[in-house]
């Protein structure tokens, strides 16, 4: 139990896509403010988003330090204007988040088809290798850098003139597929991490079709 007018945060939820990671919670504060702390299982607590009236806190900078670690966050509630005040047990009121392991749980963002190039009866489709906020040696890593061969892409492709789809897979960011000469094709891709049990698949990319500006044709 906390001070009379302070309520504990609840519904603590991790929202994470391509490692951009925000902790959200309820309720909207009335006469109270929040501070968030984050820690790895074996590490020290680090405070973030001090005395905020927001109900979210961007924890990306912390989790990208090691995306394979498991993190726990907690949200402290303080009376507005009296942040030194504590609960009856002498501690501020707080609520723990679920554990969160970014490598296993971050959602895969919607991929984008970067380009496609036709040479005769082959088409090379390239998926954009999205940059993440994960850093190594002062450079930002791409999704492929982080996940390596754990990440695959599924390509859906079909003749513009028909509805019958085909599919192909790659564990790089490129597909080389056979097509019928003289036919226009449309493409969509989906990212998948087969080894996961949750958040395994992205949404489909926007559809790109031959005859539009992303493509190139060569005899």
């Amino acid at each position: 139990s906390g001070t009379t007018n302070t309520v504990a945060a609840y519904n603590l939820t991790w929202k994470s896509t391509n490692f951009k990671t925000i902790l959200e919670w309820e309720p909207k504060p009335v006469n109270q403010v929040y501070t968030v702390q984050i820690s790895t299982k074996s590490g020290d607590w680090k405070s973030k988003c001090f005395y905020t009236t927001d109900t979210e806190c961007d924890l990306t900078d912390e989790i990208v330090k090691d995306v394979k670690q498991t993190y726990l966050a907690r949200v402290f509630s303080y009376p507005a204007g009296n942040v030194e005040s504590t609960g009856s047990a002498g501690e501020p009121l707080y609520e723990n988040s679920p554990e969160f392991t970014p490598y296993l749980e971050t959602n895969l963002g919607q991929p984008t088809i970067q380009s496609f190039e036709q040479v005769g009866t082959k088409v090379n489709v390239t998926v954009e290798d999205e940059r993440t906020l994960v850093r190594r040696n002062n450079t930002f890593l791409s999704l492929r850098d982080v996940f390596g061969k754990d990440l695959i892409y599924t390509l859906y492709y079909w003749k513009s003139s028909s509805s019958g789809k085909k599919t192909a897979k790659t564990n790089t960011n490129e597909f080389l597929i056979d097509v019928d000469k003289g036919e226009n094709y449309c493409f969509s891709v989906q990212a998948v991490i087969p080894s996961r049990t949750v958040n395994r698949k992205s949404t489909d990319s926007p559809v790109e079709c031959m005859g539009q500006e992303k493509g190139e044709f060569r005899e």
């Epitope: 599919t167 897979k169 087969p194 080894s195 049990t197 698949k201 949404t203």
Partner: antibody
Framework: EVQLVESGGGLVQPGGSLRLSCAAS????????MHWVRQAPGKGLEWVGW????????IYDPKFQDRFTISADTSKNTAYLQMNSLRAEDTAVYYC??????????WGQGTLVTVSS | DIQMTQSPSSLSASVGDRVTITCKAS??????LSWYQQKPGKAPKLLIY???SLADGVPSRFSGSGSGTDFTLTISSLQPEDFATYYC?????????FGQGTKVEIK
């Protein structure tokens, strides 16, 4: 525990239709691809097609494209195979399988479809 | 479409024998190949995926190798419970295709 249970098989006349169901438990089908594979008596395995239940994308072996339709109901956690214009050569055990995108890790027990007059 | 040619179609072997089954793809499928074991009246069971990776719970006497067009399933020391039919499957592009199967029988 992950389980796939097919149902809906049986005896049907040539030219008839049948809808097979694949009820999944222990996981959410929208997180995976779901396939149908068939096996004629004494023969090998033959891939029919797949669905991504999350977005409804379907892929078929072209030989089945015109007569077979795969669908899914994520609220029932069930995939379906609608088979029309059935022929004697469609007689087979029909299996559904879960696909992680790297392998088919779970299969149902199969349901026998017999097409005969 | 990619054809998968599996050989032999059947073989007779004794307990303790080393058994090798091959699958040849009509074109490059990288490592998008898995192997399945099927016993009469039962559903197929995953043994090997991505060509060399052993599925959970599968005994280490089973191994897979190869990439591109040529793949091999090896059983290092055949056990009584290994008498079954084995199938390869390419899942790199549609239509996915199975090999014709290899029936491993008791000599």
């Amino acid at each position: 525990e992950v389980q796939l249970v097919e149902s809906g098989g049986g005896l049907v006349q040539p030219g008839g239709s049948l809808r097979l169901s694949c009820a999944a438990s222990g996981f959410n089908i929208k997180d995976y691809y779901m396939h149908w594979v068939r096996q004629a008596p004494g023969k090998g395995l033959e891939w029919v097609g797949w669905i991504d239940p999350e977005n409804g994308n379907t892929i078929y072996d072209p030989k089945f494209q015109d007569r077979f339709t795969i669908s899914a109901d994520t609220s029932k956690n069930t995939a379906y195979l609608q088979m029309n214009s059935l022929r004697a050569e469609d007689t087979a055990v029909y299996y559904c399988a879960r696909d992680t995108a790297a392998y088919f890790d779970y299969w149902g027990q199969g349901t026998l479809v017999t097409v005969s007059s | 479409d990619i054809q998968m040619t599996q050989s032999p179609s059947s073989l007779s072997a004794s307990v303790g024998d080393r058994v090798t089954i091959t699958c040849k793809a009509s074109r490059d499928i990288k490592s998008y190949l898995s192997w399945y074991q099927q016993k009469p009246g039962k559903a197929p069971k995953l043994l090997i995926y991505y060509a060399p990776s052993l599925a959970d719970g599968v005994p280490s006497r089973f191994s897979g190798s190869g990439s591109g067009t040529d793949f091999t399933l090896t059983i290092s020391s055949l056990q009584p419970e290994d008498f079954a039919t084995y199938y390869c499957l390419q899942h790199g592009e549609s239509p996915f295709t199975f090999g014709q199967g290899t029936k491993v029988e008791i000599k």
